[in-house]
Amino acid sequence: MCYGKCARCIGHSLVGLALLCIAANILLYFPNGETKYASENHLSRFVWFFSGIVGGGLLMLLPAFVFIGLEQDDCCGCCGHENCGKRCAMLSSVLAALIGIAGSGYCVIVAALGLAEGPLCLDSLGQWNYTFASTEGQYLLDTSTWSECTEPKHIVEWNVSLFSILLALGGIEFILCLIQVINGVLGGICGFCCSHQQQYDC
């Protein structure tokens, strides 16, 4: 098991996932590709929590770059032991992974709440309401009720799709950061197993 290579692998994956989270969150601001609802403040309250942009996005880039940096072979070592610096780095990556767990956890929780509450939409009474808030998420199973939202067009599909994507991406980020906690602890305790000659690609 090469802990450094594994960390780099996780790091690159997190960068991709973070960018996808940011994109998904940004799309939530433009239902049906329109800007008017953001300017009129007719968006779900959970869109304004920036869960994908901050939690699953920017906050995830910090551990991602830390993990990618672990694979570098320029650690000077300490106490006469070449791997000692890398061990310290691996252990410090656990701290970065915990930050990632917090960010992805935030993303997952907000996305789940956004899915459960449903979108803010112009309902069948001509009012801007959280039409499905009282259904406790049951609306997700009954698509026939989605027509209760008359505006924005396809807002239920839009919100369900994007919050589901954020939920999934945040979940994957959470698992990857959890893996890196284990990887970092093992790497820090066991030391680096990769010699200068070993080259593994993700």
Epitope: L125, G126, Q127, W128, T150, E151
Partner: antibody, heavy 120, light 106 residues
Framework: QVQLVQSGAEVKKPGASVKVSCKAS????????VKWVRQAPGQDLEWMGW????????IYAADFKGRVTMTTDTSTSTAFMELRSLRSDDTAVYYC?????????????WGQGTLVTVSS | EIILTQSPATLSLSPGERATLSCRAN?????INWYQQKPGQAPRLLIY???NLASGIPARFGGSGSGRDFTLTISSLEPEDFAVYYC?????????FGGGTKVEIK
Amino acid sequence: QVQLVQSGAEVKKPGASVKVSCKASGYTFTNYGVKWVRQAPGQDLEWMGWINTYTGNPIYAADFKGRVTMTTDTSTSTAFMELRSLRSDDTAVYYCVRFQYGDYRYFDVWGQGTLVTVSS
Amino acid sequence: EIILTQSPATLSLSPGERATLSCRANSGISFINWYQQKPGQAPRLLIYGTANLASGIPARFGGSGSGRDFTLTISSLEPEDFAVYYCQQWSSNPLTFGGGTKVEIK
């Protein structure tokens, strides 16, 4: 000024269909909903449904579901209401009405009404 | 379905008198709107949101009430006020109107 102008009176046979138009002027058509109400001779006002003029999504009253179709043409700021399978008790004056979305959703501008007579 | 019952069905009064029209719902509602209709004409908005006077409506018209009981008051009847008055709710679908109160000259 703000107004809704409806199409002229119609006489139809039972089983036929009627399509009433409602042309809006003096305001931004897509900023308001249009609802349809009818009033049979000497009877109360009866709500048929409404249409979101921005998205074109209609909401129909249960009594008319399957028999009514509400549409809009935003290029001409016109709303349409088609009622199928006409019966003699569909004889009424049909009104289109503008309303603003929000807390009170009051109906401040009414069309002049279209008399639809269903008779064999 | 929320049913609105208006009373009285007919109110016979003279010009200058005070008119009090009642509208009762079979369950609690958040607000009510009032309309005036004259023969051969479309209804006209008088009061929205229970107590707010619509644009261009004289101050002699007033609305009040909450929950299930609502009232339209005309402080001093003018000759042009003799018409049919409807209350309307949209707290839930279907939107419903009351049966109307006809205010006629005594």
